[in-house]
């Protein structure tokens, strides 16, 4: 199995969750740091990230298949300040591995709604504050 990283988003009321998911082998978890950057085209690193998560080996997980680890960054209420380009990344200095997810964007519209574009799973997500639903 190949190590990879994916980005996704979910809405809970007015909250927007940005999710970075890393798929990896159980034994490769240790040493990995997953992080989310905003408006960092070339220098996305744990030090410049909005949030980071250090993975640890979980001895309770049986088998040697692929497992997933998630970092979740929650925006309680999206404002124009949250507009920008985001990227999920992961790094393991222990293994010399760098993973860079696709860029995705949050665009705050004049109507008070916002759209999330560029996510691989769903190409275009549109969120409405008023309705609190995915449209």
């Amino acid at each position: 199995g190949c190590i990879n990283i994916t980005s996704s988003a979910s809405q809970e009321g007015t909250r927007l969750n940005l999710i970075c998911t890393v798929w990896h082998k159980k034994e490769e978890a240790e040493g990995f740091v997953v992080f989310l950057c905003k408006d960092r085209s070339g220098d996305c690193s744990p030090e410049t990230s909005l949030k980071q998560l250090r993975l640890k080996r979980d001895p309770g997980i049986d088998g040697v298949g692929e497992i997933s680890s998630q970092l979740m960054f929650t925006i309680s209420q999206v404002t124009p300040l949250h507009s920008g380009t985001y990227q999920c990344c992961a790094r393991s200095q222990k293994s010399g591995i760098r993973l860079q997810g696709h860029f995705f964007s949050i665009l705050f519209t004049e109507t008070g709604n916002y759209t999330v574009t560029g996510l691989k799973q769903r190409q275009h997500l549109e969120f409405s504050h008023n309705e609190g639903t995915l449209s």
Epitope: I3, Q93, K94, S95, G96, I97, R98, Q100
Partner: antibody
Framework: QVNLQESGPGLVQPSETLSLTCTVS????????VYWVRQPPGKGLEWMGR???????DYNPALKSRLSISRDTSKSQVFLKLNSLQTEDTAIYFC??????WGQGTLVTVSS | DIQMTQSPASLSASLGETVSIECLAS??????LAWYQQKPGKSPQLLIY???SLQDGVPSRFSGSGSGTQYSLKINSLESEDVATYFC?????????FGGGTKLELK
């Protein structure tokens, strides 16, 4: 089984360029990074630089002006070039898969 | 660069004894510390990563601890095969740096 093997000249003249090759097996260079570390005889370890799985490189600032690391993924080889050699560059040169698996090292002597 | 000060530089101990090796970082390295064992003429072998995580195949008599700037490697019930030089490594900050090494000998 993960294996790394360093190869290159045992003796290099001062002011010349050192070229070393690290040939790997048991893993893909697009999945794991390779680091270079050196050790002067009887002394400590110095990290020189690395090439990540995605092909990006980092260098020790103390060596950056003289060092370059590249790779040929199809041949499973990583290359180190260190120019303007001085006698202080005499060392055992190791390549490693990240921090976990190391080659046995190759001794390079810089002398005229 | 972060300086890693390792102590002692050399250590003599008897079989069955417990020994400790210390590494002091010049600034907080947030547990991003590894310990290596190197035998003469051989390449370093990773013992411990992230301050306290024992690597696969490493005997349980080896253990690592510490946080912030202070870290230690402990070898319980010393065996003859443990005679080697031990190095610490920080990879918290670029560039990664090693301690100067501790040579462990038998009394």
């Amino acid at each position: 089984q993960v294996n790394l093997q360093e190869s290159g000249p045992g003796l290099v003249q001062p002011s010349e360029t050192l070229s070393l090759t690290c040939t790997v097996s048991g893993f893909s260079l697009t999945s794991y990074g390779v680091y270079w570390v050196r050790q002067p005889p009887g002394k400590g370890l110095e990290w020189m630089g690395r090439i990540w799985n995605d092909g990006g490189t980092d260098y020790n600032p103390a060596l950056k002006s003289r060092l370059s690391i590249s790779r040929d993924t199809s041949k499973s080889q990583v290359f180190l070039k260190l120019n303007s050699l001085q006698t202080e560059d005499t060392a055992i040169y190791f390549c490693a898969r990240g921090w976990t698996h190391w080659g046995q090292g190759t001794l390079v002597t810089v002398s005229s | 660069d972060i300086q890693m000060t390792q102590s002692p530089a050399s250590l003599s101990a008897s079989l069955g004894e417990t020994v400790s090796i210390e590494c002091l970082a010049s600034e907080d390295i947030y547990n991003n510390l590894a310990w290596y064992q190197q035998k003469p003429g051989k390449s370093p072998q990773l013992l411990i990563y992230y301050a306290s995580s024992l690597q696969d195949g490493v005997p349980s008599r080896f253990s690592g601890s510490g946080s912030g700037t202070q870290y230690s490697l402990k070898i319980n019930s010393l065996e003859s095969e443990d005679v080697a030089t031990y190095f610490c490594l920080q990879d918290s900050e670029y560039p990664p740096t090693f301690g100067g090494g501790t040579k462990l000998e038998l009394k």
